[in-house]
């Protein structure tokens, strides 16, 4: 959807920084649009030698990087902070790094929660 | 259509406190944090925080901390910014500001600015 | 804090120019920045979120690019209006932050 009419979507929430930046910590984040943008669930992430960080999920807002993507995967090849972007409800469940300039991908799998829904 | 209007010019001796409201229209008034920054004469933008209007939660900049008291009232949209102990150097324009609902949090909606001059 | 660092910090340009302003963040800031639009007596107006997308009615001559620590705002041909500063501004961890602006002017 996204064309024409308000589109909602489901992502899964979390904020690392949940305590200074005044918000929940994890949860369920549901998306409602405008008319004519289109929402993503997104992702984002730190390796530290192996060891991951998760740092923010949730919403994302209209962004054509994140078009037409059916999974959150990350293809900067390096960076401080990996970053993806999807469409789908709860996409950004799992997460992964796979490079454009090619190298081994890495697939993020979550703990198993109970997530609950942020209002 | 969306819209933040904010309170008149304020002269303020120093030592004193202001305090500037924004008014929201054309939208949810709850469903978006508001954002306040300033700028001085000739100078950048400056964040100072936000509050969510649905919680009531806030987030100063430590810069502003014990000086900064933002609140506001649900039931007629409007959003607050206290400032106390005013110093010559707090002269500045006062913007409210909207965030977007989801990340990135983008500052969508602008307030036209307050000027508060602090003179003696 | 991370710190937001623009350059020029003034550029002078014609009508039809193409401008180029970059931003660099003290660490990664992923997506997470975004560039206003300021001209004289006036409030802050959104040009670009998430570092490359288009705020709605803002014209598609400019653009905005980059991720991590460095990023571009490009005005593709100048026009009158455009005459204005500019900020970049990250939202990825508090404080915000801003950049200390571009003043673009005519030449």
């Known amino acids: 959807s996204g064309r024409g009419e308000a589109e909602t979507r489901e992502c899964i929430y979390y904020n690392a920084n949940w305590e200074l930046e005044r918000t929940n910590q994890s949860g369920l984040e549901r998306c409602e649009g405008e008319q004519d943008k289109r929402l993503h669930c997104y992702a984002s992430w730190r390796n530290s030698s192996g060891t991951i960080e998760l740092v923010k999920k949730g919403c994302w807002l209209d962004d054509f990087n994140c078009y037409d993507r059916q999974e959150c995967v990350a293809t900067e090849e390096n960076p401080q902070v990996y970053f993806c972007c999807c469409e789908g409800n709860f996409c950004n469940e799992r997460f992964t790094h796979l490079p454009e300039a090619g190298g081994p991908e890495v697939t993020y799998e979550p703990p198993p929660t109970a997530p609950t829904l942020l209002t | 259509q969306v819209q933040l209007v904010q309170s008149g010019a304020e002269v303020k001796k120093p030592g004193a406190s202001v305090k500037v409201s924004c008014k929201a229209s054309?939208?949810?008034?709850?469903?978006?944090?508001m954002h306040w920054v300033r700028q001085a004469p000739g100078q950048g933008l400056e964040w100072m925080g936000w509050?969510?209007?649905?919680?009531?939660?806030?987030n100063y900049a430590q810069k502003f901390q014990g000086r900064v008291t933002m609140t506001r009232d649900t039931s007629i949209s409007t959003a607050y910014m206290e400032l106390s102990r005013l110093r010559s150097d707090d002269t500045a324009v006062y913007y409210c500001?909207?965030?977007?609902?989801?990340?990135?949090?983008?500052?969508?909606?602008w307030g036209q600015g307050t000027t508060v001059t602090v003179s003696s | 804090d991370i710190q937001m660092t623009q350059s020029p910090s003034s550029v002078s340009a014609s009508v039809g120019d193409r401008v180029t302003i970059t931003c660099r963040a003290s660490?990664?800031?992923?997506?997470?920045l975004a560039w206003y639009q300021q001209k004289p007596g006036k409030a802050p107006k959104l040009l670009i979120y998430?570092?490359?997308s288009l705020q709605s009615g803002v014209p598609s001559r400019f653009s905005g690019s980059g991720s991590g620590t460095d990023f571009t705002l490009t005005i593709s041909s100048l026009q009158p209006e455009d005459f204005a500063t500019y900020y970049c501004?990250?939202?990825?961890?508090?404080?915000?932050?801003f950049g200390g602006g571009t003043k673009v002017e005519i030449k």
């Open positions: 054309g939208y949810t008034f709850t469903g978006h944090k």
């Open positions: 509050i969510n209007p649905a919680s009531g939660w806030t």
């Open positions: 660490q990664g800031i992923s997506r997470w």
């Open positions: 501004q990250q939202a990825f961890s508090h404080p915000w932050t």
């Open positions: 998430a570092a490359s």
């Open positions: 500001a909207r965030v977007s609902m989801y990340a990135p949090e983008p500052m969508d909606v």
